[in-house]
């Protein structure tokens, strides 16, 4: 895939020279990315920086070489020639090349992997060598208990002398195991710097010379035997380097074909893209993106609205610097540091931002660790929000400092801009919190439904066992009761959360919450009544059941009383919840006119095996799931469960008329249950599993 080029704009590799005393100098062939021997056949190692600069200018006469700088890491070069010898087959040598800098000096675009920090030091009173600044960078990282990951010179003040260094420090552990960032760097480093020079790609995870030096030499020596026979001119190396390119072209579309006309060069497109101002666009999202700031010559974050805007809009700082960092140095636009033909430049689109921690939570299906995942996502959300907020506050301070001499109206505009930013961030955080909580609630609800179904199935199965084992039945009943308890607890908690964050919505869903609590109540009543269809079991575990029911009633009293007296129920981490005012208003969940007591929400009242509760207005008669032929007029102990013929059940209907004059819209709530599992002995109890949860 060819990229249009202007003059020298499409060079494959950066101009650089390498020296090994006693051998002829080598220089990078910028057209094919291979090392070539000295064209004059005479020049060997040069010991002055001026001489190195001059040599660069000699071997690259067509380029405007203005300075040299030592490369950050050594490379292995084969085929060193001796003066006056045709045969150049010698040991490979591991040397640090000098980069020949073209045109106006532009600092390197350093990639900053995740969790790493970009730092720089400038000293206008110091003019020092590459080695000095490398040491400064290394020591600065060490002081912060981090590793030097990459570095570059700043502000040239002479030949291979500089007034500063930019560098990236990474956490100690990250260096060795952060494979992702290494991969990303390898993709980019070839495009922007190394051409087909595989040595650059190999070492790009850690460009600090000290690291992995011996390994690399050893590796090369092992391969050397093969090289001597097969690789007369380095084709093997070249092929290796081409592979990532082919992958890259599959992954992305070329600038040349997607965003430019045939007459427009890549240079012009990149220049145009990178010189546009950051544009939020008409939409109101707050997506954190990067743009190239021409006034400062580097990439900076901005908030993208989610639509419109322009192409100076990148997902990451690295990506932004890769596209714009070297291209926008102007003089380099005209010479070597161009997007290369090997790997088409990926220009940003205005797509949604990369998923963050919260998105990951939202995109991952719920599992047994739902609560832990939720807590983690919540913490990450708060941390992200705090970080963004403090960033904006820092920026605000800086902007106000710069604006202090501006007219009042302009100062006001700066302040207004940042006030809007802060409000917008707050709103975004609130929305994300809400989304997080709602997703969590939905997942918990789904899990509770599953657990309750399972518990109920196990309870029924235990009851139907021949012969039934009372202990086992009780254990299963206990688990079932706990599952229902959790459902009710969850429902109340959810309602409380909604009531705190959105009282209007709470008013709308209040009747549904009531209905759902009522459904739980009825379902538990029916489930318990099944126990009394197996009197032998019921009698044996009566005491424990009474105790269980008493506990359940106490629990319900506590939950509901707590809701009435204290409106705040913490939902895990209170940081997620807006703080409440001190007023403790009564929860308007229950009617207060006396017609509806706390008892109405208890699942059942304790009763003996011989006294089935009467069917009052507020209690639905338990469903006898037996076919009509096997059914007596009343459901009473002794009827037995063992002869259920589920295949004869097609539908179980239950009409529960709730008549309350307290303003709830739950009048004729018809609950229809289908025996969907016809043929299995569970069909009869499907009605008890209330699949359709009524809460919104």
């Amino acid at each position: 895939l060819e990229v249009p080029t202007d003059g020298n704009a499409g060079l494959l590799a950066e101009p650089q020279i390498a020296m090994f005393c006693g051998r002829l100098n080598m220089h990078m062939n910028v057209q094919n990315g291979k090392w070539d021997s000295d064209p004059s056949g005479t020049k060997t190692c040069i010991d002055t920086k001026e001489g190195i600069l001059q040599y660069c200018q000699e071997v690259y006469p067509e380029l405007q070489i203005t300075n040299v700088v030592e490369a950050n890491q050594p490379v292995t070069i084969q085929n060193w020639c001796k003066r006056g010898r045709k045969q150049c087959k010698t040991h490979p040598h591991f040397v640090i090349p000098y980069r020949c800098l073209v045109g106006e000096f532009v600092s390197d675009a350093l990639l900053v992997p995740d969790k790493c920090k970009f730092l720089h030091q400038e000293r206008m009173d110091v003019c020092e060598t590459h080695l000095h600044w490398h040491t400064v960078a290394k020591e600065t990282c060490s002081e912060k208990s981090t590793n030097l990951h990459d570095y570059g010179m700043l502000l040239p003040c002479g030949i291979d002398k500089f007034r500063g260094v930019e560098f990236v420090c990474c956490p100690l552990a990250e260096e060795s195991d952060n494979v992702d960032s290494a991969d990303a760097e390898e993709d980019d480093s070839d495009v922007w710097w190394g051409g087909a020079d595989t040595d650059y790609a190999d070492g790009s995870e850690d460009k600090v010379v000290e690291v992995a030096e011996e390994e690399e030499v050893a590796e090369v020596e092992e391969e050397e035997a093969d090289d001597d026979e097969d690789d007369e001119d380095g084709d093997e190396v070249e092929e290796e380097a081409e592979e990532p390119y082919e992958e890259a072209t599959e992954r992305t579309t070329s600038i040349a074909t997607t965003t430019t006309t045939t007459t427009e060069s890549v240079e012009e497109v990149v220049r145009e893209v990178c010189s546009e101002q950051a544009e939020t666009g008409p939409c109101r999202a707050m997506i954190s993106r990067w743009y190239f700031d021409v006034t400062e010559g580097k990439c900076a974050p901005f908030f993208y609205g989610g639509c419109g805007g322009n192409r100076n809009n990148f997902d990451t700082e690295e990506y932004c610097m890769a596209v714009c960092g070297s291209a926008m140095s102007q003089s380099l636009l005209k010479t070597t540091q161009e997007p290369l033909a090997r790997d088409p430049v990926k220009l940003p689109t205005t797509a949604a931002s990369t998923p963050d921690a919260v998105d990951k939570y939202l995109e991952t299906p719920g599992d047994e660790n739902e609560h832990a995942h939720f807590q983690k996502a919540k913490e990450r959300l708060e941390a992200k929000h705090r970080e963004r907020m403090s960033q904006v506050m820092r920026e605000w301070e800086e902007a106000e400092r710069q604006a202090k001499n501006l007219p009042k109206a302009d100062k006001k505009a700066v302040i207004q801009h940042f006030q809007e930013k802060v409000e917008s961030l707050e709103q975004e955080a609130a929305n994300e919190r809400q989304q997080l909580v709602e997703t969590h609630m939905a997942r918990v609800e789904a899990m509770l439904n599953d657990r309750r179904r399972l518990a109920l199935e196990n309870y029924i199965t235990a009851l139907q066992a021949v012969p039934p084992r009372p202990r086992h039945v009780f254990n299963m009943l206990k688990k079932y009761v706990r599952a229902e308890q959790k459902d009710r607890q969850h429902t109340l908690k959810h309602f409380e959360h909604v009531r705190m964050v959105d009282p209007k919505k709470a008013a709308q869903i209040r009747s549904q919450v009531m209905t759902h609590l009522r459904v739980i109540y009825e379902r538990m009543n029916q489930s318990l009544s099944l126990l009394y269809n197996v009197p032998a079991v019921a009698e044996e575990i009566q005491d424990e059941v009474d105790e269980l029911l008493q506990k359940e009633q106490n629990y319900s009293d506590d939950v509901l009383a707590n809701m009435i007296s204290e409106p705040r129920i913490s939902y895990g981490n209170d940081a997620l919840m807006p703080s409440l005012t001190e007023t403790k208003t009564t929860v308007e969940l229950l009617p207060v006119n006396g017609e509806f007591s706390l008892d109405d929400l208890q699942p059942w009242h304790s009763f003996g095996a011989d006294s089935v509760p009467a069917n009052t207005e507020n209690e639905v008669e338990p469903v006898d799931a037996r076919p009509a032929a096997d059914r007596g007029l009343t459901t009473r102990p002794g009827s037995g469960l063992t002869n259920i013929k589920t295949e004869e059940i097609s539908e179980v209907k239950m009409d529960a008329e709730f008549r309350h004059d307290s303003g709830y819209e739950v009048h004729h709530q018809k609950l229809v249950f289908f025996a969907e599992d016809v043929g299995s002995n569970k069909g009869a109890i499907i009605g008890l599993m209330v699949g359709g949860v009524v809460i919104a």
Epitope: Q277, E395, N405, V414
Partner: antibody
Framework: EVQLVESGGGLVQPGGSLRLSCAAS????????MNWVRQAPGKGLEWVSY????????YYADSVKGRFTISRDNAKNSLYLQMNSLRDEDTAVYYC???????????????????WGQGTTVTVSS | DIQMTQSPSSVSASVGDRVTITCRAS??????LAWFQQKPGKAPKLLIY???SLQSGVPSRFSGSGSGTDFTLTISSLQPEDFATYYC?????????FGQGTKVEIK
């Protein structure tokens, strides 16, 4: 009083060099980006070069690239333009000009080139 | 590079007239445009920045409008001291570029 004063202009032969200086006073020099703008006799304004507050970004017009070097010394409140390989067409009045922007990582606003020096004349002639 | 084209290149007007000068950019520059006034032998003076914001101390008869590629400088009621040459300049990208200028002369 906010002021910019250029100096260093004069008559020079083609191929020669000159160094223009601009002394700033009355404002915090290090807080502003600076420009050189020139105007050939009877012609319009032509932007020459830009340098950011900390010298991290430097730009040149194509017509002077490789020949002119802009620099600044914030400690001395001074801006410089080193002009080498001068040509006839470089003859002009050279203005030093302050550019006001509020540029933070989240915010950019351009308030224009709001302060200009009186200009210094450079004549390139044999 | 972004080309800035001003029109007309000169305009003759009388005191009290409304004068409009336009400036067109060869590509979109958002609102990053400034207008300058220059009198013979003097340094330019900033009138308008960010397309429509009036520089402090500039009379309110001067106003700017436009965004994208088309911009206008309007002098609502020409005063004797307004006879000068006016330049537009884009600040969207480097190299910064000026329009060729519009000379406002006495009719």
């Amino acid at each position: 009083e906010v002021q910019l004063v250029e100096s260093g202009g004069g008559l020079v032969q083609p191929g020669g060099s000159l160094r223009l200086s601009c002394a700033a006073s009355g404002f915090t020099f290090s807080s502003y980006s600076m420009n050189w703008v020139r105007q050939a006799p009877g012609k319009g304004l032509e932007w020459v070069s830009y340098i950011s507050r900390s010298s991290s970004a430097i730009y040149y017009a194509d017509s002077v690239k490789g020949r002119f070097t802009i620099s600044r010394d914030n400690a001395k409140n001074s801006l410089y333009l080193q002009m080498n390989s001068l040509r006839d067409e470089d003859t002009a009045v050279y203005y030093c000009a302050r550019e006001t922007t509020v540029t933070t990582r989240f915010y950019y606003y351009y308030y224009g080139v709001d302060v200009w020096g009186q200009g210094t004349t450079v004549t390139v002639s044999s | 590079d972004i080309q800035m084209t001003q029109s007309p290149s000169s305009v003759s007007a009388s005191v009290g007239d409304r004068v409009t000068i336009t400036c067109r950019a060869s590509q979109g520059i958002s609102s990053w445009l400034a207008w300058f006034q220059q009198k013979p032998g003097k340094a330019p003076k900033l009138l308008i920045y960010a397309a429509s914001s009036l520089q402090s101390g500039v009379p309110s008869r001067f106003s700017g409008s436009g965004s994208g590629t088309d911009f206008t400088l309007t002098i609502s009621s020409l005063q004797p001291e307004d006879f000068a040459t006016y330049y537009c300049q884009q600040a969207n990208s480097f190299p910064r570029t000026f329009g060729q200028g519009t000379k406002v002369e006495i009719k």
